[in-house]
């Protein structure tokens, strides 16, 4: 499906610092339009980051995710690629966008509705670029406080884009780039794999996925500093960014009839985004079923209420 | 405080199956990707794979793929390695561990349990 | 795979001794290298992380080094409890890879 636009609807001004190759699982490149160059990254815990083209680190993991990306369709996979405009495969959650980006809304004249639809075990796992894709993790944030040389140096706090729900393998991101070789948007890889059959009270997961590839200190107390992160036992852990009054798990683990109502307020192009925890108590929506949501046209950032169903409850312990 | 707890020693024949837990307590369990690590006598370390809890996208070493599964229970905040098709190279000592950064900062592991030993001898 | 290559397998050395120990990765590894140290028995202790970051509670007489694919542990001047194996490991691709280790034993 080809755009006849490819407005520019991803805004990079910061740019990421490096993050392992190992905790990514696709990468695209914003639109030519866009004037400065980008290459957006996803991390394994569907987290979307700004990064310079030119930096060796993201020529090097482009290049292994291309290669992941070969093995797969080498491996009996499909891979099909597409071209348009760059648009997230669901709702971006605005709570982890940056201050220096800016979503535009869509410009093709479609509705700019999201809706994603729900995917299978099989599904979940077919998609993306490399074997790697963990689409399938739903309210597991990994994020805490980074250590403290890594947030001051500008690493990846506060460069976040938002976090893609993993709910839907159906939505594809599309690339306006052409000339962009191999896997560099979205796709669809279909492997042979079966999802797993084990017992799900034990949240199995088995070997028969493709793969291409503490110091627990026996006496004391661990005493937390600089270089290592607390573990909050009954906190929510979220990540708030900046003047933006959502949360980058805003689409974590929704329950059925979940709704997310996105509005626009001014972002700020100062000010460090802070990751603190969030006291228990707060709820965290399910990531089972689909989102919907409206984009507000008149766009400087995103703010999203998410409006729970009943059943809304704390995901942590 | 952060602890793994693992199981004891193992004793299996070539062909068995072994399953190894990992009892996870001071934090959240469902939030921190569990690792499993080999270690064979004399040896170096050996990266199994990782596995969230809650989460059914594990990634494995390839050396160790087919063989192995990465399970949890997330009531009892326990992790569990499997491992099947035993043999005599298969002993060693297996360790759980976690990554304890921010997911864009990488899998260097802080927190190790204390280590199970898996003899595989007929 | 990213294979890493530590140097020397062993190493000899006294109370005080400054000693340093490579690791070599196959490939860049954009300074993704963590430092472990392994007593007989227990499991591995972190001891450095990511562009050289002292892991919470190591002295501050280790330090690392390096860039590109050459990375470096020192121990400025090795205390007793120093003697022990030490292991690299990159964590910037996966399967994640570990030094094939050095051992550390007193002269």
């Known amino acids: 499906q080809h755009h006849g636009v490819t407005k520019c609807n991803i805004t990079c001004s910061k740019m990421t610092s490096k993050i392992p190759v190992a905790l990514l699982i696709h990468y695209q490149q914003n639109q030519a339009s866009c004037g400065k160059r980008a290459i957006i990254l996803e991390t394994r815990q569907h987290r979307l980051f700004c990064a310079d083209p030119k930096e060796q680190w993201v020529k090097d993991a482009m290049q292994h995710l291309d290669r992941q990306a070969a093995a797969l369709t080498r491996n009996g996979g499909t891979f099909e690629k597409q071209i348009g405009e760059v648009k997230p495969r669901t709702t971006p959650a605005a709570g982890g966008m940056d201050e220096s980006v800016v979503l535009e809304p869509e410009a093709t004249g479609e509705s700019s509705s999201l809706e994603p639809t729900p995917s299978s075990q099989e599904a979940q796992r077919a998609l993306g670029t490399s074997p790697e894709l963990p689409t399938g993790v739903t309210g597991s944030s990994g994020t805490r406080l980074p250590p403290t040389p890594k947030a001051q140096d500008g690493g990846p706090v506060g460069t976040e884009l938002f976090r893609v729900p993993p709910v839907s393998t159906a939505a594809t991101w599309q690339s306006s780039a052409p000339h962009q070789p191999g896997p560099s948007l979205w796709a669809e890889a279909k492997t042979s794999e079966a999802p797993s059959t084990q017992d799900p009270s034990t949240q199995a997961s088995t070997a028969s996925s493709p793969a291409p590839e503490e110091n627990a200190p026996s006496e004391g107390q661990r005493v937390w500093g600089q270089g290592q992160s607390p573990r909050p036992e009954n906190s929510l852990e979220r990540e708030e960014m900046g003047p933006v009054p959502a949360h980058t798990d805003a689409f974590q683990d929704w329950g059925p009839g979940s709704m997310a109502h996105v509005s626009v307020v001014p972002v700020s192009s100062e000010g460090t985004p802070s990751r603190e925890p969030v006291a228990s108590g707060s709820w965290t929506p399910k990531a089972e079923e689909p989102i919907h949501a409206t984009m507000d046209p008149q766009r400087l950032g995103v703010l999203i209420t998410p409006v729970p169903d009943a059943q809304a409850a704390t995901r942590r312990q | 405080e952060v602890q793994l707890v693992q199981s004891g020693a193992e004793v299996k024949k070539p062909g068995a199956t072994v399953k190894i837990s990992c009892k996870a307590s001071g934090y959240t369990f469902t939030n921190y990707y569990i690792h499993w690590v080999q270690q064979a006598p004399g040896k170096g370390l050996e990266w199994m794979g990782w596995y969230l809890p809650g989460d059914d996208s594990p990634k494995f070493n390839e050396r160790f793929k087919g063989r192995v599964t990465i399970t949890a229970d997330k009531s009892t905040n326990t992790a569990y390695m499997e491992l099947s098709s035993l043999r005599s190279e298969d002993t060693a000592v297996y360790y759980c561990?976690?990554?304890?950064?921010?997911?864009?900062?990488?899998?260097?592991?802080?927190?190790w349990g204390q280590g199970t030993t898996l003899t595989v001898s007929s | 795979d990213i294979q890493m290559t530590q140097s020397p397998s062993s190493l000899s050395a006294s109370v005080g001794d400054r000693v340093t120990i490579t690791c070599r990765a196959s490939?860049?590894?954009?300074?993704?290298l963590a430092w472990y140290q392994q007593k007989p028995g227990k499991a591995p202790k972190l001891l450095l992380y990511?562009?050289?970051t002292l892991a919470e509670g190591v002295p501050s007489r280790f330090s690392g080094s390096g860039s590109g694919t050459d990375y470096t542990l020192t121990i400025s001047s090795l205390q007793p409890e120093d003697f022990a194996t030490y292991y690299c490991?990159?964590?910037?691709?996966?399967?994640?890879?570990f030094g094939g280790g050095t051992k550390l034993e007193i002269k």
């Open positions: 490939g860049r590894i954009h300074d993704f």
């Open positions: 561990a976690t990554s304890p950064t921010d997911e864009t900062q990488g899998d260097y592991f802080d927190y």
């Open positions: 490991q990159q964590f910037w691709s996966t399967p994640y890879t």
């Open positions: 990511t562009d050289n």
